[in-house]
Interface confidence: low
């Protein structure tokens, strides 16, 4: 979690002198409670916006907006603490709006916004706006919270952000998978414009089951520049297990910008009608970061084989 770097953070508006400060997420009104505290924010809205850094990088940001209630407690409102919590890591980042002048009632409801918290693709956040000073221990809460799910890199606008492009979001392998016979699977995909290697991860399943019955990993060496954007094909040899007929093919690139953490692409071939189902095998997990759905690869005795070609 971080703040977007480029422009001075502003919270002043007509009729209000305000400054944005870094916050430890522990306002001193917790430690030194006040008798009179303002009411909670109203109509907290979180939206996905996009902003450029000074370097020209494009990042997704959380646009936080809220209004004040039209009660007398605005006379005691000294500012606001904005907190963003990343749910999977418990990482929290806060900023503080410090009002340097007292708020007065006016015809239009007071409205505040902040768009400088950089968020990550596919992550969920809890956004909280606390009015300051915070209430005494037994006082009514004067904050409002909302969860905010950031779309992943498949989302059209997200795809062109710097973090997604760094993960290889612009590469569309256009995978096709074809069953040649009971023992062979042909995989075709489009190479990207980088001389980097790929791994094809084949996971086969019985009909209607999620425990795999065969797995195989095939390494594709880095293509030469003249092969960029060309179709590559690989023929994978399947293990001859009756009913082990639903095949998921996942292609993992190793682009220089994301190494072992690039976005993966998958394609699946369904079983023909009414197969038999063998004994399931427990799931395993790889060392690198899971991506794009199923990512459990293993083999109880890898007898799969494969060969591949780049097409010009």
């Amino acid at each position: 979690l971080r703040l977007l770097d480029h422009r001075a953070l502003v919270c002043s508006q007509p009729g209000l002198n305000c400054t944005v400060k870094n916050s430890t997420c522990l306002d001193d009104s917790w430690i030194h409670p006040r008798n009179l505290t303002p009411s909670s924010p109203k109509d907290l809205q979180i939206q996905l916006h996009f902003a450029h850094t000074q370097q020209g990088d494009l990042f997704p940001v959380a646009h936080i907006e809220w209004t004040l209630q039209t009660d007398a407690s605005i006379l005691y409102l000294e500012g606001a603490e904005l907190s963003v919590l990343q749910l999977n890591t418990n990482e929290r980042l806060c900023v503080k709006f410090q009002f340097l002048s007292m708020l007065q009632h006016h015809r239009k409801r007071w409205r505040f916004s902040f768009s400088h918290f950089v968020v990550d693709p596919g992550q969920e956040y809890e956004v909280t706006v606390h009015h300051l000073p915070k209430p005494i221990p037994d006082g009514d809460p004067n904050h409002q919270s909302k969860n905010f799910l950031v779309p992943d890199c498949e989302h059209a606008r997200m795809k062109v952000t710097t973090p997604c492009m760094s993960s290889g979001s612009l590469w569309d392998p256009n995978i096709t998978v074809e069953t040649l016979d009971t023992q062979h699977l042909r995989v075709d995909f489009t190479l990207w414009n980088e001389s980097t290697h790929y791994q094809i991860l084949l996971t086969s399943f019985p009909h209607m089951e999620n425990h795999s019955c065969f797995e195989h990993m095939h390494h594709i060496p880095a293509p030469r520049p003249e092969e960029f954007h060309q179709r590559s094909n690989v023929t994978l040899t399947l293990r001859n297990l009756k009913g082990c007929c639903r095949h998921q093919v996942q292609i993992q690139p190793f682009f220089s910008s994301c190494l072992n953490d690039c976005l993966r692409h998958s394609a699946t071939v369904s079983c023909p009608e009414m197969p038999d189902t063998p004994e399931p095998i427990p799931d395993y997990m790889p060392l690198w970061e899971p991506r794009s759905g199923s990512s459990d690869y293993k083999d109880d005795d890898d007898k799969g084989s494969s060969h591949h070609h780049h097409h010009h």
Epitope: G122, S257, L259, L287, W288, E289, Y297, K298
Partner: antibody, heavy 118, light 107 residues
Framework: EVQLVESGGGLVQPGGSLRLSCAAS????????MNWVRQAPGKGLEWVSF????????YYADSVKGRFTISRDNAKNSLYLQMNSLRDEDTAVYYC???????????WGQGTTVTVSS | DIQMTQSPSSLSASVGDRVTITCRAS??????LAWYQQKPGKFPELLIY???TLQSGVPSRFSGSGSGTDFTLTISSLQPEDVATYYC?????????FGPGTKVDIK
């Protein structure tokens, strides 16, 4: 030069806490998963914890689950291990290690020593 | 969880000897196996990954083989600088368990 430097080890009483840090340099830290591995005096290597590049996947060894917390700050090129409720058997040299594309761990720190003793 | 065992636990051999260390997984792990060398007082160093791929900079006298459950590390001609403890490690899923180690020294 690709480098990992651990710090934060020391002597702590049973039940106490320590926070280990690992400072990475010479590579794009934010693109790599990371691990903590430990080695008790005169013993073998024991994998402790794993965190993926974007912190979306975290694993722990059963021996530390519920007591240790792995985290990272990609902006600071730093990996952390918060160790609570420490026991005598947690006494070890703790290494941070980077996984290699293709498998294994190809970059290791020099280790930091944690001693749990009353 | 999958258990990793190594044999022998220690061995002594003469300079120039061919040395073989085996590692066994209690369940199949395909080729998701690495070998490390750790010299006394030093951090471990990666020798082999993907069961048989030699890590850059590692002398060619080291080689790895195997797939599924049984794996072998071979030193074709033991050198004095090879005195160390050797560990295998599986990395197909967490926990990423190490074998107990094999201590190699010179007769």
């Amino acid at each position: 030069e690709v480098q990992l430097v651990e710090s934060g080890g020391g002597l702590v009483q049973p039940g106490g806490s320590l926070r280990l840090s690992c400072a990475a340099s010479g590579f794009t830290f934010s693109s790599y998963s990371m691990n903590w591995v430990r080695q008790a005096p005169g013993k073998g290597l024991e994998w402790v914890s794993f965190i993926s590049a974007r912190s979306s996947t975290i694993y722990y060894a059963d021996s530390v689950k519920g007591r240790f917390t792995i985290s990272r700050d990609n902006a600071k090129n730093s990996l952390y291990l918060q160790m609570n409720s420490l026991r005598d058997e947690d006494t070890a040299v703790y290494y941070c290690a980077r996984p290699k594309v293709g498998g294994g761990m190809d970059v290791w720190g020099q280790g930091t020593t944690v001693t749990v003793s009353s | 969880d999958i258990q990793m065992t190594q044999s022998p636990s220690s061995l002594s051999a003469s300079v120039g000897d061919r040395v073989t260390i085996t590692c066994r997984a209690s369940q199949g792990i395909s080729n998701y196996l690495a070998w490390y060398q750790q010299k006394p007082g030093k951090f471990p160093e990666l020798l082999i990954y993907a069961a048989s791929t030699l890590q850059s900079g590692v002398p060619s006298r080291f080689s790895g083989s195997g797939s599924g459950t049984d794996f072998t590390l071979t030193i074709s001609s033991l050198q004095p600088e090879d005195v160390a403890t050797y560990y295998c490690q599986k990395y197909n899923r967490a926990p990423f368990t190490f074998g107990p180690g094999t201590k190699v020294d010179i007769k």
